[in-house]
């Protein structure tokens, strides 16, 4: 596919600023024009680009889901930063949703880590000190915990 093969029909907002690409790339906060001669500004609060690029389109800003709080808004060069609400967390293997933190540890275990926006409470066996992993069995005795204080943001894109 040659670059010249692209023939766009672009309804660019009048306020979108244009500048010239550097070696075929546009700076963060911009995308490249159809003919490759211009860099077109992303739309603030709507889309963004984070790196030098030759993208036809800026990327859409993430919108925080219910159950999330917005730590920082989307700019033309940075996506929205969302974080799970207090008492919930996001796991690496299921990043699309926030899950409720457990309120306590299973019987025979003690809590060694608080609930944070990116991790559930951490439980270890009283005697061995080994961590508990996997689903929690029915909680017979629990050690209650209060949600942890956020220490760093959890950023999602797309």
């Amino acid at each position: 596919i040659t670059q010249q093969d692209l023939a766009p029909q672009q309804r660019a907002a009048p306020q979108q600023k244009r500048s010239s690409p550097s070696e075929g790339l546009c700076p963060p906060g911009h995308h490249i024009s159809e003919d490759g001669r211009d860099c077109i500004s992303c739309k603030y609060g709507q889309d963004y680009s984070t790196h030098w690029n030759d993208l036809l389109f800026c990327l859409r800003c993430t919108r925080c889901d219910s159950g999330e709080v917005e730590l920082s808004p989307c700019t033309t060069t940075r996506n929205t930063v969302c974080q799970c609400e207090e008492g919930t967390f996001r796991e690496e293997d299921s990043p699309e949703m926030c899950r409720k933190c457990r309120t306590g540890c299973p019987r025979g275990m003690v809590k060694v880590g608080d609930c944070t926006p990116w991790s559930d409470i951490e439980c270890v066996h009283k005697e061995s000190g080994t961590k508990h992993s996997g689903e929690v069995p029915a909680v017979e005795e629990t050690v209650t915990s209060s949600p942890g204080t956020p220490a760093s943001p959890c950023s999602l894109s797309g």
């Epitope: 670059q3 309804r11 036809l56 389109f57 800026c58 859409r60 797309g158």
Partner: nanobody, 124 residues
Amino acid sequence: EVQLLESGGGEVQPGGSLRLSCAASGRTVSNYAMSWFRQAPGKGLEFVSALNWGGDTTYYAESVKGRFTISRDNAKNTLYLQMSSLRAEDTAVYYCAAAQSFRRGGAPYGDNYWGQGTLVTVKP
């Protein structure tokens, strides 16, 4: 995970029209840019057209400019390609793709998903 399913292909005479659809399921594609590619028999994949997530910026390959129109309905999670004034050289399997964006030349950027394709045959 996004699944894309193309439909609307078929056999048509030169000068005729067809409308291809690409239905997305599994997850909304309203956050994604979308595009159509095609592969003619014995040829490589060719970029046809692309549309940004908001549907307000479109790109067309020179070979289809003025004849093809790309559009999307985010409420229906569907991408369309209206093809008119069809020519024999438009004969190909047409694929839709969703990606965070597309680079100049058509290469997908970021997460991307592809359909299985629908065959368009243009012959007298």
